[in-house]
Amino acid sequence: DAEQKACPPGKEPYKVDEDLIFYQNWELEACVDGTMLARQMDLVNEIPFTYEQLSIFKHKLDKTYPQGYPESLIQQLGHFFRYVSPEDIHQWNVTSPDTVKTLLKVSKGQKMNAQAIALVACYLRGGGQLDEDMVKALGDIPLSYLCDFSPQDLHSVPSSVMWLVGPQDLDKCSQRHLGLLYQKACSAFQNVSGLEYFEKIKTFLGGASVKDLRALSQHNVSMDIATFKRLQVDSLVGLSVAEVQKLLGPNIVDLKTEEDKSPVRDWLFRQHQKDLDRLGLGLQGGIPNGYLVLDFNVREAFS
């Protein structure tokens, strides 16, 4: 086993240099010291070590710092960041925005989205602020990473970042995340008026409460069915037929194609059939006349 072998005489390196490329893998395991590597990361990056050799260096560093790399080493990682996993990064404590931006630059175009997101999350956990510069440094990574942050981390994301979020970015967000992001979006877009406000806020409406949706229905927004389908069921089922009619405007006709799918189906179940019939769309699944809903999940005959 490589661990048991002793370093051959005359092979103990006192510095990182090109001579190490000649070492066999077991010799690197036996001879190289993790603290020496940490002190000379610039040379580790510069010298043409193979992937195998770099993976041995990483193993040595991991053994030297089992609790996670110190920030002094993280700052010097440079291209070595490419060999670090998201799991490694979760152990780190990063407080310097410059460190984050430098490493994000290294990860750019390297299929390293998971590492980049883990790094930013770790920085936020340490009390850092995700500013627009950092979002730009994250480059082409879809902002879906916002859904990977813990709710606590999300609190330190400035509202201004909401301007950069696109419709698909929130597809995998939990309800709790959506609620928090919706609040942030509301404050980000508070000075935007009319239809422009709706265009901006609609990405976040999956986090809106029934009260918010009622207020929105007063503004002739003509919500499209795709946005409607992203609303959370709990909020949607609290809206009346009249309110949904106002919310969707001419797009109300699109409910028919969605009547057997959630969340439209869930909403239909909570409406009186006679109210649905008034829409003239042939929507089925409402509460039959003469029935009363005593519980959201149980239909009882009214006698």
């Epitope: 090109e18 001579d19 490329i21 000649f22 510069e46 043409p48 070590f49 193979t50 992937y51 770099l54 291209h79 490419r82 390297q110």
Partner: antibody
Framework: QVQLVQSGAEVKKPGASVKVSCKAS????????INWVRQAPGQGLEWMGI????????LYAQKFQGRVTMTRDTSISTAYMELSSLRSEDTAVYYC????????????WGQGTLVTVSS | DIVLTQPPSVSGAPGQRVTISCSGS????????VSWYQQLPGTAPKLLIY???QRPSGVPDRFSGSKSGTSASLAITGLQSEDEADYYC??????????FGGGTKLTVLG
């Protein structure tokens, strides 16, 4: 000025071995690694391996592992490359080239040694 | 097996500008410096460009190198008949250590 002078052309039979030398001058021989690169007729360059002249440590391309041996004699500032179990596809010009520390480039080349393998 | 891809040949008339491309991957060009070598007929290769875009002393400024992502290119402006040669890109590879492209034959027309 830096010069790498190689030994003359060789003709060998299949299965035999060949040893090519490369004498360095104009710089401290132990200060730079020596690489060997070959070029088959009408083909591109192919890296074979590298030797550290100070310690004699070597690193070979996987393709040549087990057939190539690189050595050096620091007293006469000369590097050697021996290739065994020769076959016709080893017919090529063999070059030694100095490796420049810090940039990993081949900054000076020998004039080349033609090795012909033929029965 | 060649891991750096070059066009087999390019040509241009005297005075023209030609470029030679060299395509690799993240394990070579993507993470390391590229150098270029010129091999005149019947001679040993000679270093032309190192560290992606640096010229050794004595190399005319008509030769220039550039790199973007996992590709590099060599540009030659004001083409001259003595530029007719084979050109090789080279870098080191994180898997196989040192690599060369397959080489490109430059023909100067006329």
């Amino acid at each position: 000025q830096v010069q790498l002078v190689q030994s003359g052309a060789e003709v060998k039979k299949p299965g035999a071995s060949v040893k090519v030398s490369c004498k360095a001058s104009g710089y401290t021989f132990t200060g730079n690694y020596i690489n060997w690169v070959r070029q088959a007729p009408g083909q591109g360059l192919e890296w074979m391996g590298i030797i550290n002249p100070t310690k004699g440590w070597t690193l070979y391309a996987q393709k040549f592992q087990g057939r190539v041996t690189m050595t050096r004699d620091t007293s006469i500032s000369t590097a050697y490359m021996e290739l065994s179990s020769l076959r016709s596809e080893d017919t090529a010009v063999y070059y030694c080239a100095r490796w420049h520390h810090g940039t990993w480039i081949f900054d000076y080349w020998g004039q080349g040694t033609l090795v012909t393998v033929s029965s | 097996d060649i891991v750096l891809t070059q066009p087999p040949s390019v040509s241009g008339a005297p005075g023209q500008r030609v470029t030679i491309s060299c395509s690799g991957s993240s394990s070579n060009i993507g993470s390391n410096y590229v150098s270029w070598y010129q091999q005149l007929p019947g001679t040993a290769p000679k270093l032309l460009i190192y560290n992606d875009n640096q010229r050794p002393s004595g190399v005319p400024d008509r030769f220039s190198g550039s790199k973007s992502g996992t590709s590099a290119s060599l540009a030659i402006t004001g083409l001259q008949s003595e530029d007719e040669a084979d050109y090789y890109c080279s870098t080191y590879d994180r898997r196989t250590f040192s690599v060369f492209g397959g080489g490109t034959k430059l023909t100067v027309l006329g």
